[in-house]
Structure formats: C-alpha cells, structure tokens
C-alpha cells in the first residue's frame, strides 16, 4: 500500500514538473510574441514614415539626377550662406559639370531671373587658387570668368549663364545642395 502511495506521489510530481514546463514554454512564447509585436509595430512605423518621406528631395527643393538644390529667398554674405545651408543638412552648391551648370542656370532663369547666387567656391588668399569648399579644384571650364579686384576674401557666384567672383562680404542669394534620397522601391 505504501509503495502504491509512493508511485502515485511520483506520478503527481512528474505531472507537476510537466505543467511547470508547459507554463514556462507558454511564458516564453508570450514574451516572444510581445517582442515580435513590438518589432512589427516599429517596422510598420518606419515603413509609414519612409513612405511619408519617400520623395527624393525636401519640399521647395529642386531635383536633378542625384542632387537636390535649394534656391534661397534671402540675401546673405558668403559665410552666412554656408551656415544657412548647414542648418538644412546641405552645403553651398558645388558644380561638377557643364551639364549641372546648364541645369542650374536654366532653373534660375525660370524661377527668379538674373540675380546673383553664392556657390561653394572661394579663392585661396595666398595661392590665388580657386577651390570648392570640400577642397577640390573646379574643372577648367568652371572657373570664374573675371578676377575680382578686391583686397578681401573672394568667393564665387552664379549669375545668368556665368560663374563670377566677388568680395565674400557682399550680400547675395545662395544655392544649397544635398544628395537626393534613393527610392527603395
């Protein structure tokens, strides 16, 4: 009789262990589901915000190939123009080719007509070399047409179809540039 009771007790204990295991599995499963739910929600939020911001350029910016351009509506000196572009996560326009120059001048004609726009080009005071703001040299066809007669720092600007130079402390409009966002579709 004692042996029978002992066997029943062992069976009950075994059952209890199995139930505990099942409960543990269920808890793990539940936690896993919660984590997956969180992940799914985050994924959906990201997808939604990506879909919402899927245009390659921000509002009021113009796209051409891999670049977005912003044509300012305010005047500022060259250094302040540079700061204004940085605020937007961009830099002053750096013209890499004649095609880009043609696009810019064509767009400006449509938008505003014949005004002056600072670009990211400046002349080194010691060597007289023209350099883009990232330190690279402009291609020969994209050098300012006239040398500014100024004792102060000299910077480049676009007017009509030309790249010209002027004292960096004069007030002009400016053009910012950033990379266009690639579409993931």
């Amino acid at each position: 009789k004692l042996l029978q009771v002992s066997t029943i007790a062992m069976q009950q204990q075994e059952k209890l262990i199995q139930q505990e295991r099942a409960l543990l599995n269920f808890t793990e499963w539940k936690r896993s589901c919660a984590l997956q739910m969180k992940y799914c929600q985050a994924f959906m939020q990201n997808s939604l915000s990506s879909a919402h911001n899927s245009s390659p350029c921000p509002n009021n910016w113009i796209q051409n190939r891999e670049s977005c351009y912003y044509v300012s509506e305010i005047w500022s000196i060259w250094h302040t123009s540079q700061e204004n572009c940085l605020k937007e996560g961009s830099t002053l326009l750096q013209i890499e080719s004649k095609e880009e120059m043609d696009f810019i001048t064509g767009s400006l004609r449509k938008i505003k007509g014949s005004y002056d726009y600072w670009v990211g080009l400046s002349q080194d005071g010691h060597s007289g070399r023209w350099l883009w703001q990232d330190g690279s040299s402009p291609s020969p066809g994209l050098l300012p047409a006239e040398r500014s007669q100024s004792a102060n720092q000299v910077c480049g600007y676009v007017k009509s179809n030309s790249l010209l130079s002027s004292n960096c402390s004069t007030w002009k409009y400016f053009i910012c540039e950033k990379y266009a966002l690639r579409s993931s579709v």
Partner: nanobody, 116 residues
Framework: QVQLQESGGGLVQPGGSLRLSCAAS????????MGWYRQAPGKQRELVAA???????TYADSVKGRFTISRDGAKNTVYLQMNSLKPEDTAVYYC??????????WGKGTQVTVSS
C-alpha cells in the same frame, strides 16, 4: 538637454598633428550637420570645417589640404584631424551641432596651442 564633449586639444609644435573629437549626447533629434569652429584671442569665431549627415564637407580656405573632418554617425561623434599645424591655428576650438529640429548646440571648447 544636449551635451557636447570635446577632447584632443593640447600643445603641439609647428608642423605637428592633433585629432579633436566631439561626442554629442542627450535628447538630440537627428543631426543635420556637425562642425568645428575656432576663436583666437581678439578675433571672431570662424568656421573651420563641417560635415553634413550625408557626409558632404566644407572647409575654411586656411585649412584646406591640412585638416580633415569625419564623423561616426552611429556614435553622434565628429572628428577633426589637424596636420601641418601652424602657429596661426592656435585658438579655442568649439564643436557645433545643427539639429534637424532647427536647434543649434555648442560645446565648451578645447584649447589648441601651436608653439615651439
């Protein structure tokens, strides 16, 4: 509150090198750009170099070819590698962050002295 921690300044001989670091921490929205500025005694603060979130760079004429700005986007950290240092590079160097929400933040500055 946003904190900017600059480091790497010091005394160096002309022709020497230094590497400045600036780490942004705290409740910062996404960063549009980070930059290094400097201010020498009796002079205005000027932009030395900046880098946008997309990696576009801009440099002051006086440092082109000598200084290189880089960033680690994951760590919200910007670096300024300064080579061929000259006495005229002596200044307090400040880090600045342009946040996407329009806010701008300044670090406390790190002294760089170039002298023999």
């Amino acid at each position: 509150q946003v904190q900017l921690q600059e480091s790497g300044g010091g005394l160096v001989q002309p022709g020497g090198s230094l590497r400045l670091s600036c780490a942004a921490s705290g409740s910062i929205s996404s960063i549009n750009a980070m930059g290094w500025y400097r201010q020498a005694p009796g002079k205005q603060r000027e932009l030395v170099a900046a880098i946008t979130g997309q990696g576009r760079t801009t440099y002051a004429d006086s440092v082109k070819g000598r200084f290189t700005i880089s960033r680690d986007g994951a760590k919200n950290t910007v670096y300024l590698q300064m080579n061929s240092l000259k006495p005229e590079d002596t200044a307090v160097y400040y880090c600045k962050v342009f946040a996407a929400d329009g806010m701008e933040y300044w670090g406390k500055g790190t002294q760089v002295t170039v002298s023999s």
